[in-house]
């Protein structure tokens, strides 16, 4: 060390940490999910942890069953409070089929467009919540690869409720939903025993989503 070295009081540089994410939540709203307000409670608990705004995190929600509906776009609301009010009002649209590939593909192709509020250069995150094997699983591999090609980080949540209530094997279902999640799977895949248990994963899911902001 140079003999002229001096210790001076200095201010540490501001930590450069992007607080911007574009998050699209893809919700299975098919008939098997009950009670639906467990899903809206999950949304509420997750969204209230977010700092939502046009220069911060943006959230859009897509619901699917047989068809896909854009509940609201990424740029629709400019505060956490507004998003919470809107999310609470989301009704279960139903459907006898679970078209998960269609839901994910629609989110990628439509929800993540600039027209719907996606921002250039901002990290894209998709959260997929479903309670059953997809009826269009032959399309899933390609749809997931398309998301991968567009650098969309995916968190997937398997609700085992209808399987457990029906005493059905969850093995195939869990494998499918794991395949949707980004790598490493153990950090991006969640499963819950039933709809009521969705709220129990919010803290961990939130932390893992926010960890992306720092990368």
């Amino acid at each position: 060390v140079s003999p002229t070295f001096q210790v001076v009081n200095s201010i540490a540089p501001v930590q450069e940490c992007s607080t911007q994410l574009d998050i699209v939540i893809v919700l299975d709203g098919s008939n098997s999910i009950y009670p639906w307000d467990s899903v809206t409670a999950f949304l509420n608990d997750l969204l209230e942890r977010m700092d939502i705004g046009p220069k911060q995190t943006q959230v859009g929600i897509v619901q699917y069953g047989e068809n896909v509906t854009h509940e609201f776009n990424l740029n629709k609301y400019s505060s956490t409070e507004e998003v919470l009010v809107a999310a609470k009002k989301i009704v279960q649209r139903g459907g006898r089929q679970t078209m998960t590939a269609l839901g994910i593909d629609t989110a990628r192709k439509e929800a993540f467009t600039e027209a719907r509020g996606a921002r250039r250069g901002v990290k894209k995150v998709m959260v997929i919540v479903t309670d059953g094997e997809s009826h269009d699983n032959h399309r899933l591999k390609k749809v997931i690869q398309d998301c991968e090609d567009e650098n969309i980080q995916r968190f997937s949540i398997a609700i085992l409720g209808s399987y457990n209530r029906g005493n059905l094997s969850t093995e195939k279902f869990v494998e499918e939903i794991k395949s949707i999640a980004s790598e490493p799977t153990e950090k991006h895949f969640f499963n819950v025993s039933d709809e009521l248990a969705l709220v129990t994963i919010v803290k961990t899911l939130g932390e893992r989503i926010f960890a992306l902001e720092a990368t």
């Epitope: 639906w36 279960q92 457990n164 005493n167 025993s193 248990a197």
Partner: antibody
Framework: QVQLQQSGPGLVKPSETLSLTCTVS????????WSWIRQPAGKGLEWIGR???????NYNPSLKSRVTMSVDTSKSQFSLNLSSVTAADTAVYYC??????????????????WGQGTTVTVSS | EIVLTQSPGTLSLSPGERATLSCRAS???????LAWNQQKPGQAPRLLIY???SRATGIPDRFSGSGSGTDFTLTISRLEPEDFAVYYC?????????FGGGTKVEIK
């Protein structure tokens, strides 16, 4: 057929905890959500909350701070604890099943099977 | 929470007559998850109708339910002596589950 058999004390002292148990027969406890409902004499019905076999719960916000539900799948039983009771908690307490069926689609029936009811009086 | 308002409070009718009971919700009931229950003195409620219009197992076809959204109706086409009781509507589409105040169907 499905039967729900309720048990527990009929008299509870003020400030103590009311504890009731419901034993399920004729149906798998893991296949349904299970609810507790109460009805003060001559009045209407009030839903207390629900529980699933995993232990997941959902309580009525009006009672949430005092309610605890639990389940013992090995005994096919689920239970209700209501703490810090007052005379206002005097009522007939019912357990019930939230029915569902998968035919060509999923059908949810609401509270389709009820226990016989337990009259609980809060008094010193 | 969804508030359910039943009318009339009491319905005085004779056996053989038609009974029409109304239930109005303060907001739309999700997926029309509305049930009708019958309760007789000293007994637990009994499910009659689920999903607004489907009859529960073993319920006679003189009982029918209709309506959607916020307005629901239970109709008993021809009252039998055993039908005189209190009827409650109940929504199970959102938590907390809520019940109407009840309609008492009494013998005129």
């Amino acid at each position: 057929q499905v039967q729900l058999q309720q048990s527990g004390p009929g008299l509870v002292k003020p400030s103590e905890t009311l504890s009731l148990t419901c034993t399920v027969s004729g149906a798998s406890i893991s296949s349904y959500y299970w609810s507790w409902i109460r009805q003060p004499a001559g009045k209407g019905l009030e839903w207390i909350g629900r529980i699933y076999a995993s232990g997941s719960t959902n309580y009525n916000p009006s009672l949430k701070s005092r309610v605890t539900m639990s389940v013992d799948t090995s005994k096919s039983q689920f239970s209700l604890n209501l703490s810090s009771v007052t005379a206002a908690d005097t009522a007939v307490y019912y357990c019930a099943r939230e029915g569902w069926e998968r035919l060509q689609d999923y059908y949810y029936y609401g509270l389709d099977v009820w226990g016989q009811g337990t009259t609980v009086t809060v008094s010193s | 929470e969804i508030v359910l308002t039943q009318s009339p409070g009491t319905l005085s009718l004779s056996p053989g007559e038609r009974a029409t009971l109304s239930c109005r919700a303060s907001q739309s009931v999700s997926r029309n998850y509305l049930a009708w229950n019958q309760q007789k003195p000293g007994q637990a409620p009994r499910l009659l109708i689920y999903g607004a219009s489907s009859r529960a197992t073993g319920i006679p076809d003189r009982f029918s339910g209709s309506g959607s959204g916020t307005d629901f109706t239970l109709t008993i086409s021809r009252l039998e002596p055993e039908d005189f009781a209190v009827y409650y509507c109940q929504q199970y589409g959102s938590s907390p589950l809520t019940f109407g105040g009840g309609t008492k169907v009494e013998i005129k």
